[in-house]
């Protein structure tokens, strides 16, 4: 227990102390007091450095004194022979004697008392940063005006934290600037700007004077800037050592000013402002930026436009431009959007043609359409080559985005007709010689295919049956063979408006305008046994001259049979109309004079008994095209005749080309257009 005073006597005092003794006393007075130890009697064997016998006074690890020998007071008014004053509240006294004493020594008598210490003056280290106040048993620290005592109750500092700056521009300085800043302080300032603005700090070198760094380069007083996970500083010294313009890239900045106990410097002053957050000028491939600027900042909006042939795609739709905003985080909105090559997609297929699978369908790629040769050709030109254009369409230099149209090649038989074996009035033929030949089964007649949807025939063939059944592609018209050939279904029959309809057709003597068109429900697929015949051109080249040869074909009456089962054909010359008029009508149904002959009729035949006959009606009189010897055109249609095996009359197709074209045009589907 600490005591305020006490007495310490050597063993056996005042008798002689024994040999070989070691005894210690621990003195403790209350906290806040020092110890005054004084000896009133001292009689201990003397030796050099008190090596034999001694009384030792120890404070902590320090020996305050070591006594031996005899002492007497110098002051007649005081009994004290030796005294010690320590500013600590603990002291140890140790007495030692060796194995022999040459004389009789009586030892010592000592007393201790607790004494007040002045903590403010008695120590090398001053306990208070500013004002120290001593009292009995202790002290307290106090501070000058505008300072406050820290929690350690020793250090004073200034209250310079807690300020939050939100204005877009401002000035901040150390406390008392330009007078010396307070020591032993930590000042924290916060700048908090609207998102999208970065704090920019500007200082002048001369506005900065902070206690310099120590020999190791550590700042004793320091100014530090903290922006998110970035730190600028610590800074100290005379004149600002850092960059005079600090772009923090953040809308929040903490400024921390830390000072120690010493120093008399003026401190610092800075300005700050909010700069709109910059966004990087990004290199976006295949696009242009508008407006183009050297620097983009928060809230700037740019229109990014893809170069021709590039687009931004989302799902199945695309756009050629978009907007991007410089955002509060310094990044562009819509940065995911990239201009990529336009994809024209898999090219559309075309009827009767094909397109090779493209290696690529992206902008700039090239594809080629071809028609199914030799039966189809590209009607609308352009060569069939298309490139993927910037608008996402496959484009041809001539046709633009319009697709090529593969239309049947007309008038070219796969095998030319040769009169092989001479039979009466004609030869056997193969359908490949006359692929345009159409067979009508009721009435038994013929027709000529002129394109995918239309059959040309004589009006008298269809006047009694507006829904004829027709076949193509077969040489034989035996029922078993017809079952395997292509049957054509009519959609509508168009009889020439100049054809006079009679109540008793058998008595007809006027075959003027004996022409009709049959519109088919479905298109005909062309091939070696099915392909159309050409129509005559409108130029004078297509005016027939006497002696011009033409081919007729059909399954009509022959010398031997009323109907042929296999296709027959003959080559006939064109004859003057009078030759037909001169032939006596076989089994006339009226006076010979009643039969009408018009310029709409062609007379042909008269050679070797070759002629068309009943059952051949509507078939083509095919003449070689004067402008393209590889092709045949339908110069005439088998119409009527005075007598089989002589001369026959054929509808002059050239006179009806306008009507044919108009009728087909007015009754076509959009697909055909």
């Amino acid at each position: 227990e600490p005591t305020m005073y006490g007495e310490i006597l050597s063993p056996n005092y005042p008798q002689a102390y024994p040999s070989e003794v070691e005894k210690s006393w621990d003195i403790e007075v209350p906290e806040g007091y020092g110890i005054h130890l004084y000896f009133t009697h001292l009689d201990i064997e003397l030796s050099e450095n008190c090596a034999y016998d001694s009384v030792q006074i120890i404070s902590g690890d320090t020996e305050e004194g070591r006594l031996c020998g005899q002492r007497s007071s110098n002051n007649p008014h005081s009994p004290i022979v030796e005294e010690f004053q320590v500013p600590y509240n603990k002291l140890q006294v140790i007495f030692k004697s060796d194995f022999s004493n040459e004389e009789r020594f009586t030892g010592f008598a000592a007393y201790y008392v607790a004494t007040d210490i002045n903590e403010c003056t008695d120590f090398v280290d001053v306990p208070c940063s500013h004002f120290c106040n001593n009292f009995i048993g202790g002290y307290f620290c106090s501070c000058p005006p505008e300072y406050f005592l820290h929690d350690d109750m020793k250090n004073c500092g200034v209250n310079c934290s807690g300020d939050v700056f939100t204005a877009l521009i401002g000035e901040i300085a150390s406390p008392n600037y330009p007078k010396p800043y307070p020591e032993n302080s930590r000042c924290e300032y916060q700048i908090r700007l609207e998102k999208g603005f970065q704090v920019v700090v500007t200082l002048r070198r001369e506005d900065f004077d902070v206690e310099a760094a120590d020999s190791a380069g550590n700042c004793l007083d320091s100014l530090v800037f903290v922006a998110g996970d970035r730190q600028f500083g610590p800074y100290c010294g005379h004149g600002f050592p850092g960059p005079l313009n600090i772009e923090t890239k953040s809308n929040a900045l903490d400024i921390i000013f830390q000072t120690d106990l010493t120093g008399q410097k003026k401190g610092w002053k800075l300005r700050y402002h909010g700069d709109p957050m910059p966004c990087p000028k990004e290199d976006t491939p295949n696009s242009t930026w508008e407006p183009a600027k050297a620097k983009y900042v928060f809230r700037d909006v740019v229109q990014i436009t893809c170069l021709d042939g590039f687009e931004v795609v989302e799902g199945r739709v695309g756009a050629t431009s978009f907007y991007s905003t410089c955002q509060s985080n310094g990044k562009w909105s819509n940065s995911k959007l990239k201009c990529q090559p336009v994809d024209c997609g898999i090219p559309e297929s075309i009827e009767n043609g094909k397109v090779e699978d493209p290696e690529s369908t992206l902008f700039g790629s090239v594809i080629r359409y071809t028609c199914e040769e030799p039966y189809y050709y590209m009607e609308n030109g352009g060569g069939g080559e298309y490139h993927c254009a910037g608008n996402g369409s496959w484009v041809n230099e001539v046709l633009g985005p319009e697709l090529p149209k593969c239309v049947p090649v007309c008038g070219v038989p796969r095998e030319p007709f040769e009169e092989k074996q001479r039979i009466i009035g004609g030869s056997d033929a193969d359908i490949k010689n006359f692929p345009w030949q159409v067979f009508f089964d009721n009435p038994w007649a013929g027709g000529a295919l002129i394109n995918e949807y239309w059959v040309l025939t004589a009006a008298h063939v269809v006047e009694g049956n507006r829904e004829p059944t027709m076949y193509v592609g077969s040489t034989s018209v035996q029922t078993s063979r017809l079952a395997k050939s292509k049957m054509l279904t009519p959609e509508h029959v168009f009889i020439h408006p100049g054809w006079k309809l009679l109540e008793v057709p058998e008595g007809r003597t006027n075959f003027d305008n004996d022409i009709a068109l049959v519109r088919l429900k479905d298109p005909v697929k062309m091939g070696p046994t099915v392909s159309p015949i050409c129509l005559p051109g409108t130029s004078s080249d297509y005016n027939l001259m006497d002696g011009d040869l033409g081919l007729i074909s059909g399954w009509g009456r022959t010398e031997k049979r009323d109907r042929a089962v296999r296709l027959k054909a003959a080559r006939l010359p064109v004859a003057p109309l009078r030759k037909c008029k001169e032939v006596k009508v076989e089994k006339p149904t009226a006076d010979a004079e009643a039969y009408v002959f018009t310029p709409n009729m062609i007379c042909a035949g008269g050679e070797k008994g070759m002629d068309s006959c009943k059952g051949d009606s509507g078939g083509a009189f095919a003449v070689q095209d004067p402008n393209d010897k590889t092709k045949f055109y339908a110069a005439g249609l088998v119409s009527w005749g005075p007598q089989c095996g002589t001369y026959g009359l054929y509808t002059r197709v050239k006179n009806y080309v306008d009507w044919i074209m108009k009728t087909m045009q007015e009754n076509s589907t959009p697909r055909e257009d």
């Epitope: 809230r299 909006v301 229109q303 931004v312 989302e314 799902g315 739709v317 756009a319 978009f322 907007y323 905003t325 955002q327 985080n329 990044k331 909105s333 819509n334 940065s335 995911k336 959007l337």
Partner: antibody
Framework: QVQLVQSGAEVKKPGASVKVSCKAS????????MHWVRQAPEQGLEWMGW????????IYAQKFQGRVTITADTSTNTAYMELSSLRSEDTAVYYC?????????WGQGTLVTVSS | DIQMTQSPKSLSASVGDRVTITCRAS??????LDWYQQKPGQSPKLLIY???YRYSGVPSRFSGSGSGTDFTLTISSLQPEDFATYYC?????????FGQGTKLEIK
């Protein structure tokens, strides 16, 4: 096909927080922005913010700043929206939506009711 | 923030009618404007993007026009399934803002 499936309805007390999930299928969320839009009863649509799941960048409408947190878990292809300090006026249907050029696909919506 | 104002707030029309809804932006949004349709209890559906482009699968009776601050959504011939609420939205700059909506009701 593209689908956004949101978590079920929630009832919360004022002051609490709510976290709504939006599970995407048929596409990778890293290739798109994921937005959150809310609609109070009988009211219009209100954009709250978006996330770029590729780098976790977010932008929030000023009105919700500090209260809303949008996150994304690319491993599960899911976006989340957490709204804290709920008040009664936060009662609404919350939608997630996917965009690049526009909000082409939307979740079915999650009704959050805030009531004491 | 950019404010979007739609007019009218609501309108009644009959099947077959031609209907026009307008949307005005408080500042220039160029062509960064989309239109959405929302039916009760359903999520919004995109109709028109970039002011005038019809989204895939949207009937041709819906069309959009305008640029800058004034935009129009037109339904050329109303069908029974078109009765809904229509919203415009600017995507020119964040925050992306919606109009307050136009409720199209059957007369």
């Amino acid at each position: 096909q593209v689908q956004l499936v949101q978590s079920g309805a929630e009832v919360k007390k004022p002051g609490a927080s709510v976290k709504v999930s939006c599970k995407a299928s048929g596409f990778n969320i890293k290739e798109y922005y994921m937005h959150w839009v809310r609609q109070a009863p009988e009211q219009g649509l209100e954009w709250m913010g978006w996330i770029d799941p590729e780098n976790a960048d977010t932008i929030y409408a000023q009105k919700f700043q500090g209260r809303v947190t949008i996150t994304a878990d690319t491993s599960t292809n899911t976006a989340y929206m957490e709204l804290s300090s709920l008040r009664s006026e936060d009662t609404a249907v919350y939608y997630c939506a996917r965009s690049r050029l526009f909000f082409a696909y939307w979740g079915q919506g999650t009704l959050v009711t805030v009531s004491s | 923030d950019i404010q979007m104002t739609q007019s009218p707030k609501s309108l009644s029309a009959s099947v077959g009618d031609r209907v026009t809804i307008t949307c005005r932006a408080s500042q220039d949004v160029r062509t960064a404007l989309d239109w959405y349709q929302q039916k009760p209890g359903q999520s919004p559906k995109l109709l028109i993007y970039s002011a005038s482009y019809r989204y895939s699968g949207v009937p041709s009776r819906f069309s959009g026009s305008g640029s800058g601050t004034d935009f129009t959504l037109t339904i050329s011939s109303l069908q029974p399934e078109d009765f809904a609420t229509y919203y415009c939205q600017q995507q020119y700059t964040t925050p992306y803002t919606f109009g307050q909506g136009t409720k199209l009701e059957i007369k």
